[in-house]
């Protein structure tokens, strides 16, 4: 009598996560009688996947009707495959007994699971940085298999080269994660810039996944300050203008000081955007020259995005103007927002 053979024709099978995997196994004889069992892995720690005779295995169904006469096909179908199902599966013939005795194993079929990477998540620096500084962006994607993966960084469509990428774990695993860091040198024009992390994987069929971050979250463009005096008005009032230009973000507080004393404080709000994404703001102060004996030192103090205040001062020459008794030092708040 010929010795029983357990035939697993495929050395390996690759399946997309969520699909069903078919693991083929046939035996060469009905004799000796006894169950076929499927295991993942070999040795004492192997995991029982299916036993036709005993137990319930809701995810596993036999491919052929095992109750059919002369059935020698013990192939199984495992539904809803996840990366955790990866491994080598063995079809094992047992001789009926109390307990059943292992007789022969198939050569094994390695099941690999193709799992899509998760959508890349890009995170930027915790604090804003100014132009000419370098900031780091990180991109993370998880749960993919096989391990081979490509990750690229782009800034405004141009590929970045200052990149460090790691795929973990280094050894064999059911699924993998990728983490990449890109270093970007900021320019004043980057308010509207965007970095893109692009992940390509065999499971994506040439349609890479992208994660984005806006540099507007990472950049601070400090303002330029300019204080100027308009020509004297007929009522002896001088209009002094503080022009705050090309700043980002909008969070800005402006304080006028007259001879070191706070005259007025304003907060920027609802400013129109420049083409490059920055903002401008103009504030003015009316100074009644006739109310002062001495020259008036006006200071425009700007606190931008929580940074130390920046000052710009201007002296109004009182000696050049005739004096009037009893007039107010400063006019009402007539500051306006200008582009």
């Amino acid at each position: 009598e010929e010795e029983l053979q357990v035939i697993q024709p495929e050395k390996s099978v690759s399946v997309a996560a969520g699909d069903s995997a078919t693991l083929n196994c046939t035996v060469s004889s009905l004799i000796p009688v006894g169950p076929i069992q499927w295991f993942r892995g070999a040795g004492p720690g192997r995991e029982l996947i299916y036993n036709l005779k005993e137990g319930h295995f809701p995810r596993v169904t036999p491919v052929s009707d095992p109750t059919k006469r002369n059935n020698m096909d013990f192939s199984i179908r495992i539904s809803n495959i996840t990366p955790a199902d990866a491994g080598t599966y063995y079809c094992v013939k047992f001789r009926k007994g109390s307990p059943d005795v292992e007789l022969k194993s198939g050569a094994g079929t390695e099941l690999s699971v193709r799992a899509k990477p998760s959508a890349p998540v890009v995170s930027g620096p915790a604090v804003r940085a100014t132009a000419e500084h370098t900031v780091s962006f990180t991109c993370e994607s998880h749960g993919f298999s096989p391990r081979d993966i490509t990750l690229k960084w782009f800034k405004n469509g141009n590929e970045l080269s200052d990149v460090q990428t790691n795929v973990d774990p280094a050894g064999k695993s059911v699924s993998y994660s990728i983490r990449s860091t890109a270093r970007v040198v900021l320019t004043r024009r980057d308010v509207h810039s965007q970095v893109i992390c692009e992940v390509a994987h065999v499971t994506l069929q040439g349609d890479p996944l992208r994660g984005t971050a806006n540099l507007s979250e990472a950049i601070r463009v400090p303002p330029f300050l300019e204080v100027t005096q308009q020509s004297m008005r007929a009522d002896n009032q001088v209009n002094v203008t503080c022009q705050v230009t090309k700043f980002y973000p909008q969070r800005l507080q402006l304080t006028w000081l007259e001879n070191g004393n706070v005259s007025r404080t304003e907060m920027a709000s609802a400013l129109p955007e420049n083409k490059d994404g920055t903002y401008n703001w103009t504030s003015w102060l009316l100074v009644n020259v006739s109310a002062h004996r001495d020259d008036v030192k006006l200071t425009c103090q700007v606190e931008h995005d929580g940074q130390p205040a920046v000052n710009k001062s201007f002296s109004v020459k009182v000696s050049a103007h005739p004096k009037e008794q009893g007039s107010n030092t400063a006019a009402e708040n007539t500051g306006t927002n200008e582009r």
């Epitope: 009905l30 004799i31 009688v33 036709l52 005779k53 005993e54 137990g55 319930h56 009707d65 095992p66 109750t67 059919k68 006469r69 002369n70 059935n71 009926k96």
Partner: antibody
């Protein structure tokens, strides 16, 4: 340990009805075909009925002598198989065995101890 | 239906000798190279116990002194050497087709 325990036998009059029960333990009942076989001095061992698995749509088969009178059924949740016997005849007298079919081929590897049915007026 | 005829109806064999029981089917019980014949032993007050499956294969836990052979329509159960505990009635049964049928039995007595 595989165990099959029959119950429900007794003395019945011809034309009467009776239901035999068999409770199984020690194995995954729902994965096995189950059978009833009876034995009498006159007829020897006689296969009566078979019920297959849920995956076989609980297909049933009967000996010609009981067809239309006997009904085999199973309740996998209770690991039980039943034999409903109607219109009983004297020749239905015997020991009724509940049997597990190991390999879907009338491979009768485990038998219960049997329950006795006597049909007599 | 396939009729199974067993012979002899009874036999007496000396301890240590060979007992041979025959079972003839009215129609072949062989398909696809397999012989769908089974042998059982029954002692008084007990249910039958499976000895041999598919004509020639020893059921788990059955002593090796029991053996089966045959194909098609003619099958044989051999017991050698016979022991005292082998005194029983032996039945053949087929599963070649529905309905499954049993032979009439052979009563073995040990001398």
């Amino acid at each position: 340990e595989v165990k099959l325990e029959e119950s429900g036998g007794g003395l019945m009059q011809p034309g009467g009805s009776m239901k035999l029960s068999c409770v199984a333990s020690g194995f995954t009942f729902s994965n096995y075909w189950m059978n009833w076989v009876r034995q009498s001095p006159e007829k020897g061992l006689e296969w009566v009925a078979e019920i297959r698995l849920k995956s076989n749509n609980y297909a049933t088969h009967y000996a010609e002598s009981v067809k239309g009178r006997f009904t085999i059924s199973r309740d996998d949740s209770k690991s039980s198989v039943y034999l409903q016997m109607n219109n009983l005849r004297a020749e239905d007298t015997g020991i009724y065995y509940c049997i597990r079919d190991y390999d879907y081929d009338a491979y009768f590897d485990y038998w219960g101890q049997g329950t006795t049915l006597t049909v007599s007026s | 239906d396939i009729v199974l005829t067993q012979s002899p109806a009874s036999l007496a064999v000396s301890l240590g000798q060979r007992a041979t029981i025959s079972c003839r089917a009215s129609k072949s019980v062989s398909t696809s190279g397999y012989n769908y014949m089974y042998w059982y032993q029954q002692k008084p007050g007990q249910p039958p116990k499976l000895l041999i499956y598919l004509a020639s294969n020893l059921e788990s836990g059955v002593p090796a002194r029991f053996s089966g052979s045959g194909s098609g329509t003619d099958f044989t159960l051999n017991i050698h050497p016979v022991e005292e505990e082998d005194a029983a009635t032996y039945y053949c049964q087929h599963s070649g087709e529905l309905p499954y049928t049993f032979g009439g039995g052979t009563k073995l007595e040990i001398k």
